[in-house]
């Protein structure tokens, strides 16, 4: 029997029942490699509470339709005296990425999963040349899911201070260059997930091979390699490779674009601080609404409730299904059953079954998926209680006044599946707007001006034109709504600019579009403020002008006009200056534009070194000073010792010259032991220091790539700017 979803075959997938602390391993084409589940288990359940394993689906006992996959077992289960067998059921829905199997629910006998994936789509429109699993569970069974970062067309430009090259990447899949309007990517070879553009040429420097890996709490790694042996002439004989480290920000504030932290010998190291690297919580509710502050999610399905005897009707070939949400179906022949989903046989309308009761409901939001489960319905002949699973999809243009209607998609062993497109399933997710601008390879970053939460305060604009009696206070935040504190406490919730006077407060505009580079300055436009008459809404323009070293000065009101419909502010600030590389001495570096000074001398070991262990080697490194360890040259800043026999190499002479670019501090040691290549290139070491406020001194990590690239990454609080 051919595998039903070949794209999903190469991997063993994971799903989690968080409530019961159960981890499922799923291999839909073969068997999972877990001894305790036996040699032919396709779905292996690991109960972490009892530390037991059970096979709940056998690869040999597989049956499939276009959208459902069932794995039976030979194990009996106790369900009201029947001799039913334990089984797993996976409902497939079309998605835009390979996606992830989601645990839905489990009864005594059946373990239900749902999987939104390109593999289930009728058309190949979303299918990739190469895609790998893009999620991972941590030790606490919390899910880290990067699927939302996958670009279906185009790519992310990696931030780098080198003006001559541009590195474009996608996450977990190759770059679709055909559907991308940008001309730069057109030349990228097919299958590449990391494309290096140099002038008019584009090179494949990495393709996805393995899925996402969790290396530490809230730190994920994705590796791309170049499959074919052909070497690139600018790589000094090395095979290119790309490592992307996704870091969950220690606070909500620090999301960034991907940054290149090292690139010697075509080993590209990228760091990406993103909230998607944080664990995603599963939200559940027994009512018809749920909200989660951390996820910035608020859902209310009560407007979908039907009253006055009407229900939603969904056609299921042999049966009609009458549904209601947030209440029971009120049609005549169902109303004794307290059913939320009522199943009526078309050929004999006296045959009526409750396919789920409204007081037995679970509403779940998980990783962008909204599911409503009604269980505890009438029993089937097998002894199962009928149950219904409704998968909601956001559709802002749904019919029926935005409510939409449920559509029956299939049945597995007395579980009925529906999809429902409705505007009420549209979840308010976090903003994806950038707080910066680009001009070719020049980058501008306004995030230093953002005020996030107390004890920080809003920026207050200076307005010299007013007398004290008629004084208006203008509160401004950048790329963020104003904080409702102090005099701005009464400001409208989503205002990014707010005017407060004795009559109250006014929304002068919301953050709806990213900043733009215009005429040498940065323009930030806030629109959709309060009404200002004639059906118009207040709009505010902020012009940010580069002023190196100044992050303290406040914005100034320049004009207001159009009958109170337009406000213009000017702001002289270091945040509007182009990001550039700066060099420093004596283990310090000063970011003159942002006004930050960094001193890494506390990391220097007066005697000794930091030891970094890999399988084959010990590395001894120091910061801004020499290592003093017996095998190592006294003036080397980094040194490599073979574990097996203490062969040693000097990886570069120590110095204290730091360089700084966009939140990244680097230290380069050069002039080490020459390689045995034709050019006898001296070995060199690059240490990249990155901010982690919780790390203290931190420790160096070797970016293990090949035998001749010595990149270390070091998360430390000493690389963090002082809070303004």
């Amino acid at each position: 029997q051919a595998a039903p979803f070949p794209e999903l075959c190469s991997y063993t997938w994971e799903a989690v029942d968080t409530k019961n602390n159960v981890l499922y391993k799923i291999n839909i084409c073969g068997s999972v490699d877990i001894v305790q589940c036996g040699p032919s288990s396709a779905v292996c359940m690991h109960d972490l509470k009892t530390r037991t394993y059970h096979s709940v689906g056998d690869s040999v006992l597989r049956s499939a339709t276009r959208s459902l996959l069932e794995f039976n077992t030979t194990v009996s289960c106790d369900q009201q005296g029947t001799n039913h067998r334990v089984q797993s059921s996976i409902a497939f829905l079309c998605g835009k990425t390979l996606g992830t199997p989601e645990f839905v629910t489990a009864t005594e006998c059946v373990h239900y999963f749902e999987w939104r994936t390109t593999a289930a789509c009728k058309k190949d429109i979303f299918k990739a040349n190469k895609e790998v699993p893009c999620y991972v569970f941590d030790e606490e069974l919390r899910k880290h899911d990067l699927n939302p970062l996958i670009k279906l067309s185009g790519a992310y430009l990696v931030d780098d201070s080198d003006p001559d090259t541009s590195l474009f990447i996608n996450v977990c899949r190759d770059i679709d260059t055909l559907r991308d309007p940008g001309s730069q990517l057109r030349a990228c070879p097919p299958g590449t997930a990391a494309c290096l553009v140099r002038g008019h040429q584009a090179f494949d420097v990495g393709q996805p091979r393995d899925g996402l890996k969790l290396v530490r709490k809230d730190r994920l790694v994705l590796s791309y390699v170049r499959e074919e042996a052909g070497k690139l002439d600018f790589c000094d004989g090395h095979s290119p490779a790309v490592t992307i480290t996704f870091v969950c920000p220690s606070e909500r504030r620090e999301g960034t674009i991907p940054k290149l932290t090292a690139k010697s010998n075509c080993r590209y190291e990228i760091e990406w601080i993103t909230e998607y690297a944080c664990h995603r919580d599963y939200l559940e509710s027994k009512t018809c609404s749920l909200s989660g502050e951390q996820q910035d999610v608020s859902i209310d399905l009560t407007p979908l409730a039907q009253s006055g005897g009407s229900s939603y009707i969904s056609d299921g070939k042999e049966y009609l299904f009458y549904l209601n949400v947030c209440g029971e179906t009120e049609i005549q022949f169902c109303n004794k059953k307290q059913a939320a989903v009522c199943q009526v046989k078309k050929s004999d309308t006296s045959q009526v079954k409750a396919a789920g009761r409204y007081h037995n409901q679970t509403l779940r939001y998980s990783d962008g998926d909204l599911t409503l489960i009604y269980f505890g319905g009438d029993e089937c002949s097998s002894g199962f209680q009928r149950m219904s699973v409704i998968n909601f999809e956001c559709n802002k243009t749904a019919g029926n006044d935005g409510k939409g209607t449920p559509v029956f998609t299939g049945e597995v062993d007395c579980t009925y599946f529906f999809t429902w497109d409705t505007e009420y399933a549209c979840v308010k997710e976090k903003e994806d707007l950038l707080c910066g601008a680009t001009d070719g390879k020049k980058r501008y970053d306004l995030s230093a001006l953002v005020r996030h939460a107390e004890p920080e305060q809003n920026w207050e604009a200076v307005d010299g034109s007013q007398t004290e009696t008629e004084k208006k206070h203008f509160f401004i935040n950048i790329c963020h709504r104003v904080l409702q504190e102090g005099k701005a406490r009464g400001c409208p919730e989503d205002a990014a600019v707010c005017a407060v006077d004795k009559n109250g407060s006014k929304n002068l505009g919301k953050f709806i579009s990213s900043p733009m580079k215009e005429k040498g300055n940065i323009q930030l436009s806030y629109s959709d403020g309060d009404d200002c008459g004639h059906g118009k809404k207040i709009k505010t323009n902020i012009t940010l002008v580069c002023k190196p070293g100044d992050l303290e000065s406040a914005p100034v009101l320049r004009t207001s006009g159009e009958g109170g419909c337009f406000y213009e502010f000017e702001w002289h600030t270091a945040a509007a200056c182009v990001l550039s590389k700066t060099e420093g001495e004596n283990c310090t570096v000063f970011d003159s534009q942002a006004g930050f000074s960094f001193d890494l001398s506390p990391l220097t070991k007066k005697n000794g070194a930091y030891k970094v262990e890999t399988k084959k080697y010990d590395f001894y490194i120091n910061v801004c000073g020499p290592v003093s360890v017996s095998p190592c040259q006294p003036d080397s800043g980094a040194c490599q010792v073979a574990k097996s026999d203490e062969k040693t190499w000097n990886l570069g002479l120590s110095n204290a010259k730091l360089s700084y670019y966009d939140g990244m501090i680097q230290l380069n040691y050069r002039g080490g032991t020459p390689y045995n290549n034709e050019r006898h290139t001296p070995r060199a070491t690059l240490i990249t220091f990155l901010c982690d406020r919780d790390a203290g001194v931190g420790f160096p990590e070797y970016q293990e790539e090949d035998n001749s690239t010595y990149n270390f990454r070091w998360y430390t609080s000493y690389a963090c700017p002082e809070e303004p």
Partner: antibody, heavy 116, light 109 residues
Framework: EVKLMESGGGLVQPGASLRLSCAAS????????MSWVRQPPGKAPEWLAL??????????EYNASVKGRFTISRDNSQNILYLQMNTLRTEDSATYYC???????WGQGTLVTVSA | QAVVIQESALTTSPGETVTLTCRSS?????????AIWVQEKPDHLFTGLIG???NRVPGVPARFSGSLIADKAALTITGAQTEDEAIYFC?????????FGSGTKVTVL
């Protein structure tokens, strides 16, 4: 097989000089740092000097107790390690060992006796 | 000058686990001390066991392991054998020189 063979020991008078040699075989000599260690009768070993490998510039280090009197050197073409000992004292009497790297491989030792 | 301190003697039985330690008079032993362990058998036969704190010399049985335990370097013999009866020396690196300890005599009864 790694082999280290010391020679050049013997009986000398205080104030005299002596040069110890160590013939190395079974490994690429220039890849490894080498040391001299001595052990007076009934006592613990005492590290004397090291000379690093080619990759680390053949730099040297000495125990403070012998610095200025003893010199470590190597002939990489012959795979020989040397210890030049000047102004010998009675307390320099010991068995002298040639050692590869961090004391992984030791020679059988050569006895040096300094006595009037 | 720093002093390296070892237990003078330890006794164990075949099959037992024994841990020897190596302390520095100047404070905690760290990976920068590049701790090494050597074994001396009768007739001044020296064999290197551990280099660089925890790297076993090739050919040395797996029952010998090096580590750092509570600010000290440690050599653990897991499942001691009669042929392990010997004197064990540790040496630590201090910026630019090695200093040996006085040795631990291990008896396997």
């Amino acid at each position: 097989e790694v082999k280290l063979m010391e020679s050049g020991g013997g009986l000398v008078q205080p104030g005299a000089s002596l040069r110890l040699s160590c013939a190395a075989s079974g490994f690429t000599f220039t890849d490894y740092y080498m040391s001299w260690v001595r052990q007076p009768p009934g006592k613990a070993p005492e590290w004397l000097a090291l000379i690093r490998n080619k990759a680390n510039g053949y730099t040297t280090e000495y125990n403070a107790s012998v610095k200025g009197r003893f010199t470590i050197s190597r002939d990489n073409s012959q795979n020989i390690l040397y210890l030049q000992m000047n102004t010998l004292r009675t307390e320099d009497s010991a068995t002298y060992y040639c050692v590869r790297g961090g004391f992984a491989y030791w020679g059988q030792g050569t006895l040096v006796t300094v006595s009037a | 000058q720093a002093v390296v301190i070892q237990e003078s003697a330890l006794t164990t039985s075949p099959g037992e686990t024994v841990t020897l330690t190596c302390r520095s008079s100047t404070g905690a032993v760290t990976t920068s001390h590049y701790a090494i362990w050597v074994q001396e058998k009768p007739d001044h036969l020296f064999t290197g066991l551990i280099g660089g704190t925890n790297n076993r010399v090739p050919g040395v049985p797996a029952r010998f392991s090096g580590s750092l335990i509570a600010d000290k370097a440690a050599l653990t013999i897991t499942g001691a054998q009669t042929e392990d009866e010997a004197i064990y020396f540790c040496a630590l690196w201090y910026t630019n020189q090695f200093i040996f300890g006085s040795g631990t005599k291990v008896t396997v009864l």
